[in-house]
Amino acid sequence: GSMGHAPKVGRLIYTAGGYFRQSLSYLEAYNPSDGTWLDLADLQVPRSGLAGCVVGGLLYAVGGRNNSPDGNTDSSALDCYNPMTNQWSPCAPMSVPRNRIGVGVIDGHIYAVGGSHGCIHHNSVERYEPERDEWHLVAPMLTRRIGVGVAVLNRLLYAVGGFDGTNRLNSAECYYPERNEWRMITAMNTIRSGAGVCVLHNCIYAAGGYDGQDQLNSVERYDVETETWTFVAPMKHRRSALGITVHQGRIYVLGGYDGHTFLDSVECYDPDTDTWSEVTRMTSGRSGVGVAVTME
């Protein structure tokens, strides 16, 4: 990526890392308002299976692994990108490496959920406090999950689907920070590992993923009031290990793997019309990206 002048800060969709033939170090940002892509400062170490989030206007890249011709190393790293300076800086590492991790943010704290280290599938969860640059373990999930989708709604952390080392999962669970405990919620209609999970309009959406046989294009959403999952319109492309985020009331899904191809496709979901549309293409196909949106 370029190391030139820092871009103007706006509401951009950032995509970090990913995988195509090997783990990638790209950081790119898409501006939905004008359809342009920015090439930004590379990650210091290539990573796929990472997660991205934004706290206090800074972008964090969490976990993943570096799968390269030289070897394969799961990552415990937390790195922070400042859009004002276009620079990455390392933060305190997690207690364990976590590939195919999920993350969520509650009250400015980053929760790192599940993931794998070699053949170990974690149920452990840890919380990062940016002001102290410290990680602390919290209550473990009830289920081991890699390729887990994580979202935060009403200050509760949801872990959805994934793979426990034996089975792909349709189960989901919810973490209550005040009680430091997890509780199962209604299972999805569909087994999904490597799905994209996000929150829009008081619902948790689970898009795509892999059911142990095939990549999926189906999408379902969980209504916390009725505690039910309902299908919405499917994506145009089947995809697992995709990136997902919400920007101005719409869901964006980025890349992923369709069983044959590493996708460059970016689709956008409009909840008002219950439709998906192709909005742009990434500069190259990839799976396992970390995605987040800058705050205004």
């Epitope: 995988y19 033939r21 796929s48 299976g49 799968n67 070897g71 394969n72 190393t73 195919r100 070699g118 053949c119 170990i120 390729g147 793979f163 080392g165 034996t166 590992s193 490597g194 892999y210 142990g212 046989q213 095939d214 697992s240 290990a241 793997y257 069983g259 590493f262 799976s287 396992g288």
Partner: antibody, heavy 120, light 107 residues
Framework: EVQLVESGGGLVQPGGSLRLSCAAS????????IHWVRQAPGKGLEWVAS????????LYAKSVAGRFTISADTSKNTAYLQMNSLRAEDTAVYYC?????????????AGQGTLVTVSS | DIQMTQSPSSLSASVGDRVTITCRAS??????VAWYQQKPGKAPKLLIY???SLYSGVPSRFSGSRSGTDFTLTISSLQPEDFATYYC?????????FGQGTKVEIK
């Protein structure tokens, strides 16, 4: 009945290329990790490469990284191992196997193997 | 890379004998060890996974155990069809590695 049948082996000169095929029946290769393992004459087993059906990620032994490429064509239910820049030390029987997951133990649905001989 | 040191490299035994084969990992591999049987000209067959779990269809005379970084395959009563070469494999971390094999021959 679950079966894997390897083909494509043969005699090749150093520096040459071969593409091995692994045709699966009785299960969908999209539902399993696929691994290649090799065995040099009179020697032990060596893991070579794996492909993850969920993410598309691949892993390679350092001895073959950059020279070999594992892939899968789900429409043909067949996995492949493209071998370039072959060396004498690549001479072996090559087996493909179905795995429960990317790092997992190989199942016993291994084929009978295909012999690759690299010699001038 | 994690080394899997297998012993003995060969052994002679009679039908009905109890046979024990050991693999020692050079570092912790948790319980991510599998055992295979291979007969001449054939592909290896999975016997044991996760150190002690019997793979489906494998006779119960085969068992596996773990003590720290030491892993053991036991055949409680050797049968004629058990004369073969046995390999251990760790899949704890990249790259997956095998032991050098133990050939079980007829005494």
């Amino acid at each position: 009945e679950v079966q894997l049948v390897e083909s494509g082996g043969g005699l090749v000169q150093p520096g040459g290329s071969l593409r091995l095929s692994c045709a699966a029946s009785g299960f969908a290769i999209s539902a399993s990790s696929i691994h290649w393992v090799r065995q040099a004459p009179g020697k032990g087993l060596e893991w070579v490469a794996s492909i993850d059906p969920e993410t598309g990620e691949t892993l390679y032994a350092k001895s073959v990284a950059g020279r070999f490429t594992i892939s899968a064509d789900t429409s043909k239910n067949t996995a492949y191992l493209q071998m370039n820049s072959l060396r004498a030390e690549d001479t072996a029987v090559y087996y493909c196997a179905r795995g429960e997951w990317f790092y997992g133990a190989l199942s016993d649905y291994a084929g009978q193997g295909t012999l690759v001989t690299v010699s001038s | 890379d994690i080394q899997m040191t297998q012993s003995p490299s060969s052994l002679s035994a009679s039908v009905g004998d109890r046979v024990t084969i050991t693999c020692r990992a050079s570092q912790s591999v948790s319980s991510a060890v599998a055992w295979y049987q291979q007969k001449p000209g054939k592909a290896p067959k999975l016997l044991i996974y996760s150190a002690s779990s019997l793979y489906s269809g494998v006779p119960s005379r085969f068992s596996g155990s773990r003590s720290g970084t030491d892993f053991t395959l036991t055949i409680s009563s050797l049968q004629p069809e058990d004369f073969a070469t046995y390999y251990c494999q760790q899949s704890y971390s990249f790259p997956s590695t095998f032991g050098q094999g133990t050939k079980v021959e007829i005494k």
